[in-house]
Interface confidence: low
C-alpha cells in the first residue's frame, strides 16, 4: 500500500491496532522490513507499507482526521471530500474526522445529503456499520451532539465555534463519499441547531447534547423539524432527567408558525404537544445549576410525523354550485382559553390552504379536508338568504328549508343553519309550515330533541325573538309579518340520526298586520305549553300576536295561565288580552296592566288568543305563559 | 435532481395553435401541483393556469384572460405536463415557463420552487 | 385580480451594502407573498415565500418582512452575484399575480 498526502493539507492518517481479539497470531505493519503497531502520516508524506498477516482487518483501524482551520484564513466550505479516496487506503475499518475551528461568531452548518442521519442513543448500532459522530465545542469543553445512522431525517446540524465530525465506515462497506457538505453561517446564538425534515409519514428519536451524560450547563439546543402540511407531527419524551438549579428554569420551548402564544414553554414533565399542523422548532433550555449539587439535565424525545387519524385525511367535496346566497363557514367551537398548548386544528381548501376559520360560499364546488385530531373541536355554521323581490311574483311560492345531504355528510357537527327569510315591506308576510307538528320550548316543557328551530326577526332595529321550537308538538304553522331568521341548531351529534325529521316549508303569503300568528292544534292528552315572544325580555312595545287554537268536536280545551297577574305597567296605550271563540264569535277581553289574568277556562271549539302590548315602563314587562290541554267531552267537567 | 425542461415553442401566425410541454424528472409528478406561467418582452410575469396534484384529480385552473383558449393537460405517465394555446394573438408573444408549485407546507399554494428554462413563442403574421 | 405593486424599477446599490425591495399589494394578502430573483437570460428562483420564509439554499443575507398590504425584501449585505431583477408575488389566491419587478444594480 502507498499512502501520499499533500502538503499543507491538513490531513493525518493513523493505523492503530482496534480492539483486541483472541486471535492467536499477531499481525503488523510492516515498513522496509521493520515491524510496527501504529503508524502515523503526515502532511507531506509518503508511505509505502504492508501487513504481515492476510486478515488486517482484524486487527487493525484506520483513522483519517484533517484539521480545517477558519480562524486565521478562509474556510473551504462546499461537499466534504474523502481524502485520501478510499480506493488508494487499505481495507480497513476506516475513520473519517474532520475538525473545523472557527471563531465564537461564525456558525457552521453540515448539511447531509440523502439519505439523511438517523440518532442512536447508547449501546445502539447501525445496521449497516457505518456511524457519523458529531461533537461540537464551548470554549475548550468537547460537547458530543450525537451519534448518527444513515437513513433518518436529520439533514441539517448548525454548530457555533467548531465542529468534529466523525465518519466511521467498516472494512466492507463501498462508500466513496463523505455525505455531507459545510457551509458558513451567521451566528447561531446557542449551542447547535439540529434540522429534521420528514418527507412522508415517519418518526425520529433524538437526544439532548452529551445524553445519556448531562446537557452543558445553561445552554440552549434547538431542533428544527420540516414537515409536509397534510401530516401531522406528535412530541413524546421517552426520558428525562433535571438538575437542581439556582436561577433560571430547564424547559422546552415550541415555535409554531402561524400560533399567536410564540413561544410555548412547557416543562419537562407536561405532556408534550401533539397534532402540529406544519413546521415547529423545539428548544431546550438549561439553567444555572447548584454548584455542591448539579444533578443532570437530559432529554431523549421522539417526533412521530402521521396522517391526521381517523377521517380527517380524506377530502370531502362540499357542492354549493346550485346553491345561491348561501355561506358556509367551519370554525372552532369556543372553549375556555387555557395557558396550556392546544395542538393545531385546521381545514384545508383544496388541500392546500390551511386555517382555523374556512368560509365557502355558493356557486361552486369545494375540496376541504381536514388537519385535526379531533373534528369535535370544530363546528358549522350555515346562512342563505331567500329573498322575494317582486311580490307579483313570489306570493304563494313555496321553499323547503332542508339542510342540505353535503353539508350532513361532512364530519364536523352542523351547529347553525340559519334561512334569511325577505319579504317587501307592508306587501307580502310568511309563514312557515313544519314537516312534524313543533313544540315550543319552555322552562316547564323543554325541547330534548337534537336539534330546534329558533325564530326571530330579521329587521335590524326590532328586537323580536318568537322562540326556540322542536319538532313533537301541537304547533302546525307560525305566521309572522315580516322579515325573520330561522335558524336550525342542533344540540346533539345525533342530529345526523334525526336529519330525517327537520323540514320546514316557508311559503310567501299575502301581507297581515299582526307580528305572529301560532296555529296550534293539541293532541289529546297532552298539555301544550305556549308562552309569549321575547321570553324573558318581554313582549315589544306596541306588538300583537294571536294563536289560533284548534279543538276537535269530541274534545274539550282547558286554557290555564301560570301567573295571576301579567305584571305589565304601561307607560302609554293599554295592554289587553281577547280570548274569541271562532264559532260563536264572543270574547272577553282581559286589560292586562289592570285585571287579574282568568281562572283556567273551558272551550269546546275552536278559539283565539290574541294579546297586544302597550308601551311599558322599563322592568314591567309583558311575559305570558300559558298551557291548553284537551279532554274528551264524555268527562264530566263540573 | 429536480428538472423541468419546455419545448414546443417558436414562431406561429396570429390565429394559429401551438402546443407546449414540459418534461419533468427528479421528483414525483403526480403528487405536485403544477404551473404554466409567462413573460411578455419587457413585462412582468403572468400566471397562466395550475394543473393541480393527483389527490385532487389533476383539476386545471384558468387565469380569466385566457380561459377557452389555453388548455392544461397531462401525461402522467410520462411525467409530462402540456399547454395546449389556440387562437393565438401577437399579445401572446413572450417566453413560456413551466414551473412546480412545490412549496408543501400549510398555507402556501401558488409557491414556484423550481421552473424551467421557458420555451420562446413568437406570434407574429 | 390582485394588483402586485414595485414603486421602483431600478435600484442601485454597492457590494456590502444593505437594500430593501419593497411590494404593494391592493388588499391584503394576509402575509402570503413570495419574493423570486431573475438573473439575465436566466428562469426566476424562488427566495422567500409566505411574507418572510427563506426557500432551502437561500443564502440568509436575503430576508422578507412584512403583512397586511405592504412587503419587504432586504439584502442585508449585497454581493455582486445579487445584480438581478426581483419580482414579488401573491399566492394568497387565484389568480397569483406579479409585481411589475425591481433591477437591482451594482454602483
Known amino acids: 500500500f502507498e499512502i501520499a498526502l499533500p502538503r499543507e493539507s491538513n490531513i493525518t492518517v493513523l493505523i492503530k491496532l482496534g480492539t483486541p481479539t483472541l486471535l492467536a497470531k499477531p499481525c503488523y505493519i510492516v515498513i522496509s522490513k521493520r515491524h510496527i503497531t501504529m503508524l502515523s502520516i503526515k502532511s507531506g508524506e509518503r508511505i509505502v507499507f504492508t501487513f504481515s498477516c492476510q486478515s488486517p482487518e482484524n486487527h487493525f483501524v484506520i483513522e483519517i482526521q484533517k484539521n480545517i482551520d477558519c480562524m486565521s484564513g478562509p474556510c473551504p466550505f462546499g461537499e466534504v471530500q474523502l481524502q485520501p479516496s478510499t480506493s488508494l487506503l487499505p481495507t480497513l475499518n476506516r475513520t473519517f474526522i474532520w475538525d473545523v475551528k472557527a471563531h465564537k461568531s461564525i456558525g457552521l452548518e453540515l448539511q447531509f445529503s440523502i439519505p439523511r442521519l438517523r440518532q442512536i442513543g447508547p449501546g445502539e448500532s447501525c445496521p449497516d456499520g457505518v456511524t457519523h459522530s458529531i461533537s461540537g465545542r464551548i470554549d475548550a469543553t468537547v460537547v458530543r451532539i450525537g451519534t448518527f445512522c444513515s437513513n433518518g431525517t436529520v439533514s441539517r446540524i448548525k454548530m457555533q465555534e467548531g465542529v468534529k465530525m466523525a465518519l466511521h465506515l467498516p472494512w466492507f462497506h463501498p462508500r466513496n463519499v463523505s455525505g455531507f457538505s459545510i457551509a458558513n453561517r451567521s451566528s447561531i446564538k446557542r449551542l447547535c441547531i439540529i434540522e429534521s425534515v420528514f418527507e412522508g409519514e415517519g418518526s425520529a428519536t433524538l437526544m439532548s447534547a452529551n445524553y445519556p451524560e448531562g446537557f452543558p450547563e445553561d445552554e440552549l439546543m434547538t431542533w428544527q423539524f420540516v414537515v409536509p402540511a397534510h401530516l401531522r407531527a406528535s412530541v413524546s419524551f421517552l426520558n428525562f432527567n433535571l438538575s437542581n438549579c439556582e436561577r433560571k428554569e430547564e424547559r422546552v420551548e415550541y415555535y409554531i408558525p402561524g400560533s399567536t402564544t410564540n413561544p410555548e414553554v412547557f416543562k419537562l414533565e407536561d405532556k408534550q404537544p401533539g397534532n402540529m399542523a406544519g413546521n415547529f422548532n423545539l428548544s431546550l433550555q438549561g439553567c444555572d445549576q447548584d454548584a455542591q449539587s448539579p444533578g443532570i439535565l437530559r432529554l431523549q424525545f421522539q417526533v412521530l410525523v402521521q396522517h391526521p387519524q381517523n377521517e380527517s385525511n380524506k377530502i370531502y367535496v362540499v357542492d354549493l354550485s346550485n346553491e345561491r346566497a348561501m355561506s358556509l363557514t367551519i370554525e372552532p367551537r369556543p372553549v375556555k382559553q387555557s395557558r396550556k398548548f392546544v395542538p393545531g386544528c385546521f381545514v384545508c381548501l383544496e388541500s392546500r390552504t390551511c386555517s382555523s376559520n374556512l368560509t365557502l360560499t355558493s356557486g361552486s364546488k369545494h375540496k376541504i379536508s381536514f388537519l385535526c385530531d379531533d373534528l369535535t373541536r370544530l363546528w358549522m355554521n350555515v346562512e342563505k338568504t331567500i329573498s322575494c323581490t317582486d311580490h307579483r311574483y313570489c306570493q304563494r311560492k313555496s321553499y323547503s328549508l332542508q339542510v342540505p345531504s353535503d353539508i350532513l355528510h361532512l364530519p364536523v357537527e352542523l351547529h347553525d343553519f340559519s334561512w334569511k327569510l325577505l319579504v317587501p315591506k307592508d306587501r307580502l308576510s310568511l309563514v312557515l309550515v313544519p314537516a312534524q307538528k313543533l313544540q315550543q320550548h319552555t322552562h316547564e316543557k323543554p325541547c330534548n330533541t337534537s336539534f330546534s328551530y329558533l325564530v326571530a326577526s330579521a329587521i335590524p332595529s326590532q328586537d323580536l325573538y318568537f322562540g326556540s321550537f322542536c319538532p313533537g308538538g301541537s304547533i302546525k304553522q307560525i305566521q309572522v309579518k315580516q322579515n325573520i331568521s330561522v335558524t336550525l341548531r342542533t344540540f346533539a351529534p345525533s342530529f345526523q340520526q334525526e336529519a330525517s325529521r327537520q323540514g320546514l316549508t316557508v311559503s310567501f303569503i299575502p301581507y297581515f298586520k299582526e307580528e305572529g300568528v301560532f296555529t296550534v292544534t293539541p293532541d289529546t292528552k297532552s298539555k301544550v305549553y305556549l308562552r309569549t315572544p321575547n321570553w324573558d325580555r318581554g313582549l315589544p312595545s306596541l306588538t300583537s300576536v294571536s294563536w289560533n287554537i284548534s279543538v276537535p268536536r269530541d274534545q274539550v280545551a282547558c286554557l290555564t295561565f301560570f301567573k295571576e297577574r301579567s305584571g305589565v305597567v304601561c307607560q302609554t296605550g293599554r295592554a289587553f288580552m281577547i280570548i274569541q271563540e271562532q264559532r260563536t264569535r264572543a270574547e272577553e277581553i282581559f286589560s292586562l296592566d289592570e285585571d287579574v289574568l282568568p281562572k283556567p277556562s273551558f272551550h269546546h271549539h275552536s278559539f283565539w288568543v290574541n294579546i297586544s302590548n302597550c308601551s311599558p315602563t322599563s322592568g314591567k314587562q309583558l311575559d305570558l305563559l300559558f298551557s291548553v290541554t284537551l279532554t274528551p267531552r264524555t268527562v264530566d267537567l263540573t | 435532481e429536480v428538472k423541468l425542461v419546455e419545448s414546443g415553442g417558436g414562431l406561429v401566425q396570429p390565429g394559429g395553435s401551438l402546443r407546449l410541454s414540459c418534461a419533468t424528472s427528479g421528483f414525483t409528478f403526480s403528487d405536485f401541483y403544477m404551473e404554466w406561467v409567462r413573460q411578455p418582452p419587457g413585462k412582468r410575469l403572468e400566471w397562466i393556469a395550475v394543473s393541480r396534484d393527483k389527490t385532487n384529480d389533476y383539476t386545471t385552473e384558468y387565469s380569466a384572460s385566457m380561459k377557452g383558449r389555453f388548455i392544461v393537460s397531462r401525461d402522467t405517465s410520462q411525467s409530462i405536463l402540456y399547454l395546449q394555446m389556440n387562437a393565438l394573438r401577437a399579445e401572446d408573444t413572450a417566453i413560456y415557463y413551466c414551473?412546480?408549485?412545490?412549496?408543501?407546507?400549510?398555507?402556501?399554494?401558488?409557491?414556484?420552487?423550481?421552473w424551467g428554462q421557458g420555451t420562446s413563442v413568437t406570434v407574429s403574421s | 385580480d390582485i394588483v402586485m405593486t414595485q414603486s421602483h424599477k431600478f435600484m442601485s446599490t454597492s457590494v456590502g451594502d444593505r437594500v430593501s425591495i419593497t411590494c404593494k399589494a391592493s388588499q391584503d394578502v394576509s402575509s402570503s407573498v413570495a419574493w423570486y430573483q431573475q438573473k439575465p437570460g436566466q428562469s426566476p428562483k424562488l427566495l422567500i415565500y409566505?411574507?418572510?420564509t427563506r426557500h432551502t439554499g437561500v443564502p440568509d443575507r436575503f430576508t422578507g418582512s412584512g403583512s397586511g398590504t405592504d412587503y419587504t425584501l432586504t439584502i442585508s449585505s449585497v454581493q455582486a452575484e445579487d445584480l438581478a431583477l426581483y419580482y414579488c408575488?401573491?399566492?394568497?389566491?387565484?389568480?397569483?399575480?406579479f409585481g411589475g419587478g425591481t433591477k437591482l444594480e451594482i454602483k
Open positions: 408575488q401573491q399566492h394568497y389566491n387565484t389568480p397569483p399575480t
Open positions: 414551473a412546480r408549485d412545490g412549496v408543501y407546507y400549510y398555507g402556501s399554494s401558488y409557491t414556484l420552487d423550481y
Open positions: 409566505w411574507a418572510s
